[in-house]
Interface confidence: medium
């Protein structure tokens, strides 16, 4: 059967297409091509007589069509109007006619698209931005890219207008990115240049650094303020509510106790119209910024349970410090049998019980720093244990909790309460 194959089927404007004829009959007189799905003399493109090898143009001939001796038709410099059906009319030597129809589609070679925006300076959590991919092109598919990735799924992103428009609702600073649009049709794909979305935001709550609160007299006070903001924030400093200067850094040399007070950083974004403040307390004090490591002294480290008492003493030479005690990572005292005295210097346990065995340490601290002692181990023995509480395993004697006693290693499961006292040691 006579058939027509279009090569290619989708043709770009300005390119060429070949209507290839298959199964052309033998013994032909000639053939003619027509625009459309039927033979119509007014729409004849070209005729060809085999005997003379002569091609004759018809009313629909444009000068861009060329017929081959094998009846195939080449159309050059394709235009949009060429899209559609083409009919080949074959005249055999016995004057019996045969027809076949083929078709192709014409698409424009897409121009490089560009992005237009309805808002070049959107404000975070307030504005929406609509990007539109230009120009509008018939039969084109529109795609969007964010930082060269396909669009993320988000309820704040909406495609409309046949995907030609991308709207970002309630923009956030995270929407600040490179946006591109791409147009595609069956014959071409073009991507736009990047458009950078510049979302205005902030200032966020400022951060004052360093985080130190305590300073010694004679030190230099150097504070820096930063708040995330676009455009960058303008900064000003207030001390105890009084304006000082409009800078991001505040520097006061050789401070005294009179420089103690509240330091306020004020950050302002004149474009978003927002401002935020942070207040920091600065204390200038003679207190030691480094506390020496204390030492524990024990009246005994091995005691007899339910009989002996023990005193643990935390020794330090620092002044203006406080002391706290720890047993098995819990703060003390933890029972009626434990007493703190001499401003927490001494921990007394009377009487010592099995559950008191373990590791103790003390910590000395002031408002500026702290330090811990090395741990000390308290061992608790029992002279006479009831026979039923001893188990012989591999010729070793182990104590087994009985009569409501807990295993020595499981004894301490109480939530401890912290006791804090202040001790002033005078040399």
């Amino acid at each position: 059967k006579l058939t027509i194959e279009s090569t290619p089927f989708n043709v770009a404007e300005g390119k060429e297409v070949l209507l290839l004829v298959h199964n052309l009959p033998q013994h032909l007189f000639g053939y003619s091509w027509y625009k459309g799905e039927r033979v119509d003399g007014n729409r004849q493109i070209i005729g060809y007589v085999i005997g003379t090898q002569q091609a004759t143009p018809g009313p629909a001939y444009s000068g861009r069509e060329i017929i081959y001796p094998n009846a195939s038709l080449l159309i050059q410099n394709i235009i949009q109007n060429d899209t559609g059906f083409y009919t080949l009319h074959v005249i055999k030597s016995d004057l019996v006619n045969e027809e076949a129809t083929g078709q192709f589609r014409v698409y424009p070679e897409l121009p490089k698209p560009s992005i237009s925006s309805n808002n070049s300076k959107p404000v975070e959590d307030k504005d929406a931005v609509a990007f539109t991919c230009e120009p509008e092109t018939q039969d084109a598919t529109y795609l969007w890219w964010v930082n060269n990735q396909s669009l993320p799924v988000s309820p704040r992103l909406q495609l409309s207008n046949g995907n030609r428009t991308l709207t970002l609702f309630n923009v956030t600073r995270n929407d600040s990115a490179s946006y591109k649009c791409e147009t595609q049709n069956p014959v071409s794909a073009r991507r736009s240049d990047s458009v950078i979305l510049n979302v205005l935001y902030g200032p966020d709550t400022p951060t004052i650094s360093p985080s130190d609160t305590y300073y010694r007299p004679g030190a230099n006070l150097s504070l820096s303020c930063y708040a995330a903001s676009n455009p960058p924030a303008q900064y000003s400093w207030l001390i105890n509510g009084t304006f000082q200067q409009s800078t991001q850094e505040l520097f006061i040399p050789n401070i005294t106790v009179n420089n103690s007070g509240s330091y306020t950083c004020h950050a302002n974004n004149s474009v978003t119209g927002c401002n935020r403040t942070t207040v920091k307390t600065i204390i200038v004090t003679e207190l030691s910024p480094v506390v020496a490591k204390p030492q524990i002294k024990a009246s005994k480290t091995t005691v007899t349970g339910d009989k002996d008492s023990v005193n643990l003493t935390c020794s330090t030479n620092d002044t203006g410090i406080s002391i706290r005690w720890f047993f098995k990572n819990q703060s003390l005292p933890s029972s009626e049998r434990m007493k703190l005295s001499q401003g927490n210097i001494t921990l007394s346990i009377n009487p010592v019980k099995r559950e008191d065995a373990g590791t103790y340490w003390c910590e000395v601290f002031n408002p500026i720093s702290k330090n811990q002692s090395d741990p000390i181990m308290l061992n608790v023995n029992y002279n006479a244990l009831p026979q039923e509480n001893l188990i012989n395993v591999d010729e070793q004697l182990y104590f087994q909790g009985g009569s409501g006693l807990n295993d020595i290693f499981e004894a301490q499961k109480i939530e401890w309460h912290e006791a804090r006292a202040h001790h002033h040691h005078h040399h």
Epitope: G14, E16, P57, S62, G63, R64, I66, L74, Q76, N77
Partner: nanobody, 119 residues
Amino acid sequence: EVQLVESGGGLVQPGGSLRLSCAASGFNIKDTCIGWVRRAPGKEEELVAQICQYHGSTRYADSVKGRFTISADTSKNTAYLQMNSLRAEDTAVYYCAIVGQNYPVYNYWGQGTTVTVSS
């Protein structure tokens, strides 16, 4: 009506020059490709040069490269073939034709113009 009319042929000595013209009617030469085809007795038909105005391209047979130049004047709807350094083997009837940009096929001969290179 589509017509291609050639002119400019004649007798010229070896090394001489001629300029052939092809006046087109019934279509715009800017929309298609125009070529010069030559036929000589005992030789194969040869497409010597072509110009595609819409594409901005020209192409030449190896045998004439550097000697022949094809051009077109769209305002006159006319194509030209400037032939320099002519040789005896360039003797032939030269036809103007509509040709395929990328295909070895051409239609619509004019009546042709004869070029004879002889001393």
